[in-house]
């Protein structure tokens, strides 16, 4: 057991197995469930994280249960197919050969079909609206302080460039964080807004994905900001294709 092995961890993803067996004895970490090598300097893609989550034995999960106020989107949990870069494949199917198309954050954007269903391209989610309700406080948070704190959080914890935090809206007790990132704006090395939103979602549920780090401790001018519910809305560059039957 060497010092190199002690250092060989993945700070940004605890759902990994790491060992110093990379090129030249360098540390290499692989995502659970897929075995894909991950870049531990940044966020792991949501697809690989969902795959790791589904592969973990139900009784051996190290993740904390969400508190009583957290809403769990059970529809959103499935064992996804990821491409070699860790992105969602445009078409997802379950074990019973039911298939559907997803966007870049893995959310279904068509009716379900069979194996003949075609999904021509992975449609990018370019606008994410995170809708939060905070627990009651003695007085409302100062809007500009709240704005600065959330921008700081997304930069420092989730590595997202501030230019992708389009706006922070606040009407006590509702906070809305708007993330925007077009295909043309996203450079190599930029964190994807979908991945940042997923890490944030898991953080506010008390299920941090970071290695050995304390949970999310959000404070605005020293006052704790405790989230009691989260809703996330996704807007794609191409509108989804659902039949009228689903809309009624």
């Amino acid at each position: 057991h060497t010092a190199a092995q002690d250092n060989c961890t993945c700070p940004t993803n605890k759902m990994t197995v790491c060992s110093p067996d990379g090129p030249g004895g360098r540390c290499q970490c692989r995502a659970l469930g897929s075995g894909v090598a991950v870049d531990c300097s940044t966020l792991t893609s949501k697809c690989l994280l969902l795959k790791a989550r589904m592969s973990a034995p139900k009784n051996a999960r190290t993740l904390v249960r969400p508190n009583e106020h957290a809403l769990v989107d059970n529809d959103g949990l499935y064992d996804p197919d990821c491409d070699p870069e860790g992105r969602f494949k445009a078409r997802q199917c379950n074990q019973t050969s039911v298939c559907w198309c997803v966007n870049s954050v893995g959310v279904r954007r068509t009716d379900k079909g069979d194996l003949s269903l075609r999904c021509d391209e992975l449609v990018r989610t370019h606008h994410i609206l995170i809708d939060l309700r905070h627990r009651p406080t003695a007085s409302a948070f100062n809007h500009s302080d709240l704005d600065a704190e959330l921008r700081r959080l997304f930069r420092e914890r989730y590595r997202l460039h501030p230019k992708f935090v389009a706006a922070v809206h606040y009407e006590q007790p509702t906070i809305q964080i708007e993330l925007r990132q077009n295909t043309s704006q996203k450079a190599a090395g930029d964190v994807d807004i979908g991945d940042a939103a997923y890490y944030f979602e898991r953080d506010v549920k008390g299920e941090s994905l970071f290695q050995g780090r304390g949970g999310l401790d959000l404070r605005v001018r020293g006052e704790p900001l405790q989230v009691e519910r989260t809703l996330i809305y996704y807007l794609d560059e191409i509108p989804p294709k659902f039949s009228m039957k689903r809309l009624t």
Epitope: T16, V38, R155, E156, R159, G189
Partner: antibody, heavy 122, light 109 residues
Amino acid sequence: QQLEESGGGLVKPEGSLTLTCKGSGFDFSGTYWMWWVRQAPGKGLEWIAPIYVGSGSSTYYASWAKGRFTISSTSSTAVTLQATSLTAADTATYFCARGATNNVFMNYFNLWGPGTLVTVSS
Amino acid sequence: FEMTQTPSSVSEPVGGTVTIKCQASEDISSNLGWYQQKPGQPPKLLIYGASTLASGVPSRFKGSGSGTEFTLTISDLEPADAATYYCQTSYYIDDGVNGFGGGTEVVVK
């Protein structure tokens, strides 16, 4: 714990060179960033590029360095910087430095090498 | 993005106080470091996180500020404090711009 740069010297204009940074007393296979920073004679400091030496090998480059400089880490004990199409403006002392955190956007340099002088002249 | 450091040079007597300012063109929270560099030597980290003293650095060095305005104050100046001081951030490294300030030469009379 220390860092040492090597590979500096006299290079002709339009020439190339490879600088190497080796660490002793610690392993590069950790969760931090290694940086190259340079300083022209009598001038200030400017960063060239960092590389993550944990799992992943992420890199960033200063705008002016893209295309001419390449940072890499092929082993757990060394980081290299390759430079091409050198001009007199690249004459400088080249330092390697270790970033103190695994987050590149919150990095400070808590360990520096003594530097190696690169002179570009015909 | 730009880091502007002032003044470029300052001269104070032994026992005096020097104040160096660094201004970021965008909010960088408290992600700022201060370095001391003497001729022929690499820089030495003095302060990180805008106000936290690095190991072994005397308490005469004090960092303050957050957001866009930062200050390094050196009190009870000693001859050994004669050096060039730099501020630095990596907050906007993905924009490819230099995160170092231009430097301040401190002369101790």
